[in-house]
């Protein structure tokens, strides 16, 4: 066969679907690789061909579109499973071609099993809700295109194993799940099961997402530097190790980049000749507020180093703050016989 533009295996699109459920998979060529859509390609006389490689096999084979009840079918740029089976797992290739043009891409499809509590190896999307923020909703994801708008599916919501009914502050409303006032106890995995009829058969779509209750923007504040502060003085003798922690609290802010850095005499540590190391640790509260600690360390401090200005800086979407550490050289303890005696006028 003539040359084909092969985009390889698109592992970015690791598609996971549940066993014994319908799945509709769009050819990634039109979404990520080509600058035209399927309709344009079809109008130009290009044909979309599907084939696959079974799990743990090397042999590419055509997809069998003649299975009973059209279990696998193709519609435009979509490959349909009605429903999937466990052994449908493999790498699928869609190829767009005519006599003069060819482009193809492969992608992995994994059919996964779930237990009666919807636990599975499926990677779950995370939806963040603000704590005590008023009514917030999550929507049953990725169910578009499975049934026409004339079909009215039944939707059942679960938290873990349990059907959501009579919960304190969570109300199922069709495709939406409303949280009247989100609390830490609402953290967890939520599943919608969408049941719809098609050609005399009943299909189920299971979608699970993780809800994480996070700090509310109503309570968000600019970064707070807990250390260094005015109460602690870093008093060292030359040759000792100087350790100064910079500890900063950041309120949770959606999509905010939290930054902490030190300057020494107004310069970044990388830009000066001192032998300084900085170690960072990060911890999170239950609502994803963040505490970052950067410890500035100089193994053997010199008297010059003890005269420098050490400033901790912090920045988030809420603002920027800075705080200087109080560093000074320890005055050597007086030697009694000489210094104190002189002080008392002894000769």
């Amino acid at each position: 066969s003539e040359r084909c533009d092969d985009w390889g295996l698109d592992t970015m699109r690791q598609i996971q679907v549940f066993e014994d459920e319908p799945a509709r998979i769009k050819c990634p060529l039109f979404e990520h690789f080509l600058k035209f859509n399927y309709s344009t390609a079809h109008s130009a006389g290009l044909t979309l061909i599907w084939y696959w490689t079974r799990q743990d096999r090397d042999l590419e084979e055509p997809i069998n579109f003649r299975l009973p009840e059209n279990r696998i079918s193709k519609e435009k740029d979509v490959l349909w499973f009605r429903p999937t089976l466990l052994n449908d797992t493999g790498n699928y290739t869609c190829m767009l071609r005519n006599t003069t043009y060819c482009s193809k891409v492969a992608f992995p499809l994994e059919v996964v099993q779930k237990d009666s509590c919807f636990n599975s190896p499926m990677k779950l999307p995370v939806h963040k809700l603000y704590i005590e923020y008023g009514i917030q909703r999550i929507t049953c994801p990725n169910v578009d295109g499975y049934f026409p708008s004339s079909v009215k599916p039944t939707i059942t919501w679960y938290m873990g194993c349990y059907k959501i009914q009579n919960f304190n502050n969570v109300i199922p409303e069709g495709m939406n799940l409303s949280f009247l006032i989100a609390l830490i106890s609402n953290n967890g995995n939520y599943t919608c099961v969408v049941t719809y009829p098609e050609n005399g058969r009943t299909f189920h779509l299971t979608r699970t997402l993780t809800v994480k209750v996070v700090g509310s923007p109503k309570n968000a504040v600019p970064p707070v530097i807990h250390s260094p502060n005015d109460h602690v003085v870093y008093e060292k003798e030359p040759g000792e190790e100087l350790l100064i922690p910079c500890t900063v609290y950041f309120s949770f802010l959606m999509d905010s980049r939290n930054e902490v850095w030190w300057t020494i005499d107004g310069k970044k540590p990388d830009d000066i000749t001192i032998d300084v190391t900085i170690n960072e640790s990060i911890s999170h509260s239950r609502t994803e507020d963040e505490t970052r600690t950067q410890i500035l360390s100089i193994k053997k401090v010199t008297s010059e180093d003890l005269k420098r200005s050490y400033v901790c800086h912090a920045r988030s979407a809420k603002g920027e703050v800075a705080k200087a550490a109080k560093v000074k050289q320890k005055v050597p303890a007086p030697r009694y016989t000489v210094e104190l005696a002189c002080g008392f006028g002894a000769t």
């Epitope: 237990d115 009666s116 509590c117 636990n119 938290m159 873990g160 194993c161 349990y162 059907k163 959501i164 009914q165 009579n166 919960f167 304190n168 969570v170 106890s185 609402n186 967890g188 995995n189």
Partner: antibody, heavy 122, light 107 residues
């Protein structure tokens, strides 16, 4: 090790209500579902319903809808089952049992209370 | 609701012998099945969950098998303390339902 301790035996008149308590000691209470099961004399086990204290969610078997109320008090780690409009066929031993956590698909009942005999008699 | 049917209703076995108890579901319950043992005047005790996993502290002579609609509890060598009533229970679909029980008695 978690233990479930139930309230004592009750004798009730037909048409009245009974409220049985189930106190958890020695471990987590909120994150588990507390299930209620009954057993009439010489009969098998019959699931009645559950409550999940942490989120307040509950569900009842169809047979008991409208007559049973299951509640929980997290502060005292106690669950309650109230059955109203009692009739003679409600004479049974009522058990509370710990179901698994929200995410454990082994939703079997691994820890049981000692049972509370409720006798309905005029 | 799913109906669980146990057989036989009564099983007469001599100590040291093997006992095989059967449980059938009216529709598939996958592997979401538990077995309980109940002695007179006591609460039930969990033996097996997930159709075949022994609960904590349950002796190895108890084993469970099956999936879908057909399940078996086997007691490989009956001890005197094993004479009791055994219940199966499905937890695949609400409401959770129990079988009517199998009484294992001394022959």
């Amino acid at each position: 090790q978690v233990q479930l301790v139930q309230s004592g035996a009750e004798v009730k008149k037909p048409g009245s209500s009974v409220k049985v308590s189930c106190k958890a000691s020695g471990g987590q209470f909120s994150e588990y579902a507390i299930q209620w099961v009954r057993q009439a004399p010489g009969q098998g086990l019959e699931w009645m319903g559950y409550i999940i204290p942490t989120v307040g969610g509950f569900d009842y078997a169809q047979k008991f809808q409208g007559r049973v109320t299951i509640t929980a008090d997290e502060s005292t780690s106690t669950a309650y089952m109230e059955l109203s409009s009692l009739r003679s066929e409600d004479t049974a031993v009522y058990y509370c049992a710990r179901g698994q956590t929200l995410y454990d698909s082994g939703r079997q009942f691994d820890i049981w209370g000692q049972g509370t005999l409720v006798t309905v008699s005029s | 609701e799913i109906v669980m049917t146990q057989s036989p209703a009564t099983l007469s076995v001599s100590p040291g012998e093997r006992a095989t108890l059967s449980c059938r579901a009216s529709q598939s319950v996958s592997s979401n099945l538990a077995w309980y043992q109940q002695k007179p005047g006591q609460a039930p005790r969990l033996l097996i969950y997930g159709a075949s996993t022994r609960a904590t502290g349950i002796p190895a002579r108890f084993s469970g098998s099956g999936s879908g609609t057909e399940f078996t509890l086997t007691i490989s060598s009956l001890q005197s303390e094993d004479f009791a009533v055994y219940y199966c229970q499905q937890y695949n679909n609400w409401p959770w339902t129990f079988g009517q029980g199998t009484k294992v008695e001394i022959k």
